[in-house]
């Protein structure tokens, strides 16, 4: 079953997908499509990479991570309700039926009316989890410290863009990443 992600109308949505290249720069083609992953390829392709670069894209769809190191997470800019649905991240590993397929469900919520600014308690209390950050060295574990005064709209942005606390890395535990080679 697909993993579910949420964003509000007007925000950027973030759909995580990772793989580990067998060697630096030894890239595997990846496609992103709207709709569940079919038997082959991606349906309704919105973005595609080859062994070197993004070679097809449609407006509002971007890879903002380092896809040359396997971060093929999709950013959808300025989402509308029409962006809701299943998205397929397909890592096209050479060989017959070797592809890895991830179905991610995007739920778009109507934008909230911004409430008056309120003091937010310690962010670790709201999101009490450890996260693994990716760098060039060994993985390290860190906790989130407290953030300055932020309103509920900002908290919503932090949570559903995921990158703001790098919670996307937790998705490795739920199978949204693959090692190649």
């Amino acid at each position: 079953s697909e993993v579910e992600y949420r964003a509000e109308v007007g925000q950027n949505a973030y759909l995580p997908c990772f793989y580990t290249p067998a060697a630096p720069g030894n890239l595997v083609p990846v496609c992103w499509g709207k709709g569940a992953c079919p038997v082959f390829e991606c349906g309704n392709v919105v973005l595609r990479t080859d062994e070197r670069d993004v070679n097809y894209w449609t407006s509002r769809y971007w890879l903002n991570g380092d896809f040359r190191k396997g971060d093929v997470s999709l950013t959808i800019e300025n989402v509308t309700l029409a962006d809701s649905g299943i998205y397929c991240c397909r890592i096209q590993i050479p060989g017959i039926m070797n592809d890895e397929k991830f179905n991610l469900k995007l739920v778009i919520k109507p934008a909230k009316v911004t409430p008056a600014p309120t003091r937010q308690r310690d962010f670790t209390a709201a999101f009490p989890r450890m996260l693994t950050t990716r760098g060039h060295g060994p993985a390290e574990t860190q906790t989130l410290g407290s953030l300055p005064d932020i309103n509920l709209t900002q908290i919503s942005t932090l949570a559903n863009e995921l990158r703001d606390s790098r919670l996307a890395n937790d998705l490795r535990d739920s199978g949204a990443t693959i090692r190649i080679g």
Epitope: R52, D53, N64, G135, H136, S165
Partner: antibody
């Protein structure tokens, strides 16, 4: 509105180190990469390096031994540190946001001029 | 490193003329990107991924090319186009810029 603003020391003595801060607004540093580019007076653009949303970095190999790029997401700041400055490091230093897809820099700061002189 | 060579270094044109500047890469690249810079200002994104105009760029500008040869064309030059234009690639590290083409309006 997306903005980037550099702040630096202006004047640096030879062999000393340089620290420049890029303060951004209108977007989250966790969702975009930020690059550093410099331009010597009357010359072209030179890429120094960048920091990704997840904190990993890429550097120009010619300068890698002297460069360090880091950031503080909560303060929306990116930092450039360069060691062992010489007179040919005199330049205008820019930070710029990466648009995504390994493509181009869609928003640039106004730059900060750094002069290396005794 | 992929070296980008821009030509000509200086281009002089009269208003209304069509002009083309080129950028040659020492190795094949997937895309070329272009920036416009006027004296005293920061570079502005102008054309990305070879042929896509950045926001606010007039339609008289166009970009084309593939492999090692790319170009920026202005169909009818206007006085406000006077600037230096830089090409840039990031098909392989490090990211590199060309030395620039300075467009002067007669």
């Amino acid at each position: 509105q997306v903005k980037l603003q550099e702040s630096g020391p202006g004047l640096v003595a030879p062999s000393q180190s340089l620290s420049i801060t890029c303060t951004v607004s209108g977007f989250s540093l966790t969702g975009y990469g930020v690059h550093w580019v410099r331009q010597p007076p009357g010359k072209g653009l030179e890429w120094l390096g960048m920091i990704w949303g997840d904190g990993s970095t890429d550097y120009n190999s010619a300068l890698k031994s002297r460069l360090s790029i880091s950031k503080d997401n909560s303060k929306s700041q990116v930092f450039l540190k360069m060691n062992s400055l010489q007179t040919d490091d005199t330049a205008r230093y820019y930070c710029a946001r990466d648009r995504g897809n390994h493509w181009y820099f869609d928003v640039w700061g106004q730059g900060t001029t750094v002069t290396v002189s005794s | 490193d992929i070296e980008l060579t821009q030509s000509p270094a200086i281009l002089s044109a009269s208003p209304g003329e069509k002009v083309t500047m080129t950028c040659r890469a020492s190795s094949s690249v997937s895309y070329m990107h272009w920036y416009q810079q006027k004296p005293g200002s920061s570079p502005k994104p102008w054309i990305y991924a070879t042929s896509n105009l950045a926001s606010g760029v007039p339609a008289r500008f166009s970009g084309s090319g593939s492999g090692t040869s790319y170009s920026l064309t202005i169909s009818r030059v206007e006085a406000e186009d006077a600037a230096t234009y830089y090409c840039q690639q990031w098909s392989s590290n490090p990211l590199t810029f060309g030395a620039g083409t300075k467009l002067e309006i007669k």
